[in-house]
């Protein structure tokens, strides 16, 4: 039961995480105008990965897309790439994990296949989460660098009578959404990998166990015991002669080509 719960929770957490990564990627508020130096501005600027926007106090908002591709900073292109890779990997991971869920029966799919798919989706979620975290972190680093550069510029060349207020940008909501979403996807991926260990058929382990059997006349049949994997509720061997009232985690499949020692 614990394996199913872990897998299901991992799937849900990853789903929320990937939805968050998509939302963050689409959001316009990756960087927002820093109002520390000019808190009384009647015009508010904010920028996303795909367009920059200006919100006037009167309520009008105007957004302009970055229609150039070559003219954009390499770092911005890199962030875009990381976020898109994260979304694509996450989407594929979700698709794979749907079929890997223990609670969903698809024909006569073996547990070994489901374990394999769970591991695959878990790794995909981990990489997806890392891509999102990396993308957001690169953008945040770019903002911090530009912030201090513009701060330095603010106090130079101001000998004239006319004051020019340079617009500085700080962290936008999308960065926090991206960090949280990336973290959730990463956690979901780890949970899927943990669930995979519990799903894996361990019959091949019995050969190893049988070598250690001393003089006892114990017959080891396939499916006779569920060997320990060292995770959760599987640390104790469970007999199958329980009147047929088995939990889903206890349903044993026959040995296959996959060995999880």
């Amino acid at each position: 039961m614990a394996v199913t719960a872990c897998q299901g929770l991992g799937f849900v957490v990853s789903l929320i995480g990937i939805a968050g990564i998509i939302a963050a990627t689409c959001m316009d508020q990756w960087s927002t105008q820093d109002l520390y130096n000019n808190p009384v501005t009647a015009v508010f600027n904010y920028q996303g990965l795909w367009r920059s926007c200006v919100r006037e106090s009167s309520g009008f908002t105007e957004c302009r897309g970055y229609f150039t591709l070559l003219g954009l900073p390499a770092m911005l292109q890199a962030v875009r790439a990381l976020m898109i890779v994260g979304i694509v990997l996450g989407a594929i991971g979700l698709l794979v994990s749907i079929f890997a869920l223990k609670c969903i029966r698809i024909g006569s799919m073996e547990d070994s296949a489901k374990a394999n798919m769970t591991l695959t989706s878990g790794i995909m979620f981990i990489v997806s989460g890392l891509c999102a975290i990396a993308g957001v972190s690169v953008f945040a680093n770019m903002l911090v660098t530009n912030f201090w550069m513009s701060t330095a510029n603010m106090y130079t060349g101001m000998g004239g009578m006319v004051q020019t207020v340079q617009t500085r940008y700080t962290f936008g909501a999308a960065l926090f959404v991206g960090w949280v979403a990336g973290g959730l996807t990463l956690i979901g991926g780890v949970m899927m990998c943990i669930a995979c260990r519990g799903l894996a058929p361990e019959e091949t382990n019995y050969k190893a166990v049988s070598y250690h059997a001393s003089g006892h006349s114990v017959a080891y049949k396939p499916g006779g015991f569920k060997a320990s994997t060292g995770f959760g509720s599987n640390t104790k061997n469970k007999k199958i002669y329980d009147g047929g009232a088995r939990t889903e985690d206890e349903v044993q499949s026959y040995p296959s080509k996959h060995d999880y020692v």
């Epitope: 105008q33 000019n38 009384v40 501005t41 009647a42 015009v43 600027n45 904010y46 920028q47 920059s52 926007c53 200006v54 006037e56 106090s57 009167s58 309520g59 009008f60 105007e62 302009r64 006319v162 004051q163 020019t164 207020v165 340079q166 617009t167």
Partner: antibody, heavy 117, light 113 residues
Framework: QVQLQESGPGLVKPSETLSLTCTVS????????VSWIRQPPGKGLEWIGV???????NYHSTLISRVTISKDTSKSQFSLKLSSVTAADTAVYYC???????????WGQGTLVTVSS | DIVMTQSPDSLAVSLGERATINCKSS????????????LTWYQQKPGQPPKLLIY???TRESGVPDRFSGSGSGTDFTLTISSLQAEDVAVYYC?????????FGGGTKLEIK
């Protein structure tokens, strides 16, 4: 059609509070801001303050301690209160709707308020 | 606060001639986000409320004759009436719409010579 109309007492005694109402039609009070502007006789325009669609306000730094702008969405009305008035507050008071570029695109006809004992 | 300085205080121009009014701000009104200058021009005729002519320094409000044009960027702005008409006699104001308080210039009185 956008319309704004100021109303209120034409005469206010010194040290009292000036209260004006701006009744509007033709636009949403929750979407657009309304500014109050005054013009002393024979002089230029002076921006008093504004209340935006979301209810937030901004006031002129010289009047901030005396002025309050509010709105009643159900009545489609904006109000201006200016406390502790003096003869220097005698002016034509206008309300105006904010549009593109924060520019004031529609104005009321204005109401003359005289501060005198 | 941003100080708006208009020049000249008054101007007399012959009918059909070009009229030029200047406005200078103490801070830049150029917004880097959209590269627009938040400066507005108004026309006020005697006994009437002001009328919006130009916003974003150069964008004419709908219904405003095309003889009115705005130019300039940053801190220096100009309102030009290409061919003065009798109905253009008024006081013209510039306004900072970039930073609170949204200050007005002192006004320029335009008369016919």
């Amino acid at each position: 059609q956008v319309q704004l109309q100021e109303s209120g007492p034409g005469l206010v005694k010194p040290s009292e509070t000036l209260s004006l109402t701006c009744t509007v039609s033709g636009f949403s009070l929750t979407s657009y801001g309304v500014s109050w502007i005054r013009q002393p006789p024979g002089k230029g325009l002076e921006w008093i303050g504004v209340i935006w669609g979301d209810g937030s306000t901004n006031y002129h730094s010289t009047l901030i301690s005396r002025v309050t702008i509010s709105k009643d969405t159900s009545k489609s009305q904006f109000s201006l209160k200016l406390s502790s008035v003096t003869a220097a507050d005698t002016a034509v008071y206008y309300c105006a709707k904010a549009g593109r570029g924060n520019a004031l695109d529609y104005w009321g006809q204005g109401t003359l308020v005289t501060v005198s004992s | 606060d941003i100080v708006m300085t208009q020049s000249p205080d008054s101007l007399a121009v012959s009918l059909g001639e070009r009229a030029t009014i200047n406005c200078k701000s103490s801070q830049s009104l150029l917004n880097s986000g959209n590269q627009k200058n938040y400066l507005t021009w108004y026309q006020q005729k005697p006994g009437q409320p002001p009328k919006l002519l130009i916003y974003w320094a150069s964008t004419r409000e709908s219904g405003v004759p095309d003889r009115f044009s705005g130019s300039g960027s940053g801190t220096d702005f100009t309102l030009t009436i290409s061919s003065l008409q009798a109905e253009d006699v008024a006081v013209y104001y510039c306004q900072n719409d970039y930073s609170f308080p949204l200050t007005f210039g002192g006004g320029t009185k335009l008369e016919i010579k």
